[in-house]
Amino acid sequence: KNLKSPQKVEVDIIDDNFILRWNRSDESVGNVTFSFDYQKTGMDNWIKLSGCQNITSTKCNFSSLKLNVYEEIKLRIRAEKENTSSWYEVDSFTPFRKAQIGPPEVHLEAEDKAIVIHISPGTKDSVMWALDGLSFTYSLVIWKNSSGVEERIENIYSRHKIYKLSPETTYCLKVKAALLTSWKIGVYSPVHCIKTTVENELPPPENIEVSVQNQNYVLKWDYTYANMTFQVQWLHAFLKRNPGNHLYKWKQIPDCENVKTTQCVFPQNVFQKGIYLLRVQASDGNNTSFWSEEIKFDTEIQAFLLPPVFNIRSLSDSFHIYIGAPKQSGNTPVIQDYPLIYEIIFWENTSNAERKIIEKKTDVTVPNLKPLTVYCVKARAHTMDEKLNKSSVFSDAVCEKTKPGNTSK
């Protein structure tokens, strides 16, 4: 009897694990084995697929094969007994495109009102994701064990802290990874649960803000109790995404160690140009608070978020406003390569009724104006970032008269 070739071959790739599954074509024939060959793009010869020769089941693992994961390959399978079936060819595929992201590893640490989450890829030193390790983002679902009401948190990194939790409460969570530039979203980790600790005697500092005065940064925060000492630490923001990096160490700001007030002042040259995280801790000599929520601190935005400069072209029923880069001293424009949004306030010169337009474009139309009427305009810039809301001061008001009727073109 002729052996039929197997059908419906499925290739499952999760991280660096390559699994093949197929259907037997003829269940009635016993003692059949199956073998695979593979072929790389641009080659004529077929090569035996190690790990998938003379298989008695309908599943095999060819993870040991060292493939270029970006190169297309083709597979074929046949059944073998005394004779062999014809080959069945599987559609060619590129391993990287087919690969799914496996569940990440998750390690939790509890504080009284926060949980620190350490996330790492499920496969250490993965070949599949070797070029993308730092591009992983993660999302999680967290719930109180007692209620089961889920909260989703998107767009987090390898080290994340969830704040504003209740003390002595068990929380459960699961995490999945994503490689968004390849449209890949992985599968969830197993559920991990942890109980937050008993409430700490000292709460962490709150409402941390950074401002610039002269050549210094001024860091301020709020605290519940008097007669405390505080310390401030900083970290390069990019290390959040690469906590395995040996540089992942929070460092002290020298002028902000053991300060007795709820602010500290340090020179701008303490930080090179870049993006940092800052955190503050309180102590009364005997007890220490947990660290505050981390704030993001961007030296360029802190130092140079200046009010926008704009020109107005007046028509009879509208203004066209053209926003340019703000000028530094010496009349050189400031290069702002972070995303900004513009708030434009305008009002009739004889009235206090202000109207507002918010726009991300740098050319804006202010509509529905009356002819031959003086209107005043001022503008400010805002950054668009979830962790860092920074606004410039308003520009000086500029007042212009609209043209007579019928000049709206």
Partner: nanobody, 126 residues
Framework: QVQLQESGGGLVQAGGSLRLSCAAS????????MGWYRQAPGKEREFVAG???????NYADSVKGRFTISRDNAKNTVYLQMNSLKPEDTAVYYC????????????????????WGQGTQVTVSS
């Protein structure tokens, strides 16, 4: 904040067609691309199709040749034309925008984030 509004879902017979739309409003400064994912009951959310800021398209193997993704940049809208629908295409379809924080100013500082729509139900009956 970005809002994504999907529409076009519904009940259709096997072999039929649907066209999903997703309009993005709000501020997306450096969009990488827009795409569609789907989630069937009891299953993980899976990628369906994506189109990046140029015209590069990506499709899941299961929908290749049947589904077509397109986008209208002027309207900030992405479409998914679904033909030859099968019962296994039944799922909630989610629109997604992937964006980045723009030109990196410091080492390793380009990150990618995703915004999700609320989802639209597609049911294919046999």
């Amino acid at each position: 904040q970005v809002q994504l509004q999907e529409s076009g879902g519904g009940l259709v017979q096997a072999g039929g067609s649907l066209r999903l739309s997703c309009a993005a409003s709000g501020y997306i400064f450096y969009p990488f691309g827009m795409g569609w994912y789907r989630q069937a009951p009891g299953k993980e959310r899976e990628f369906v199709a994506g189109i990046n800021d140029g015209t590069t398209t990506n499709y899941a193997d299961s929908v290749k040749g049947r589904f077509t993704i397109s986008r209208d940049n002027a309207k900030n809208t992405v479409y998914l034309q679904m033909n030859s629908l099968k019962p296994e295409d039944t799922a909630v379809y989610y629109c997604a925008v992937v964006y980045t924080n723009g030109p990196a100013r410091t080492r390793g500082d380009n990150y990618y984030h995703i915004y999700w729509g609320q989802g639209t139900q597609v049911t294919v009956s046999s």
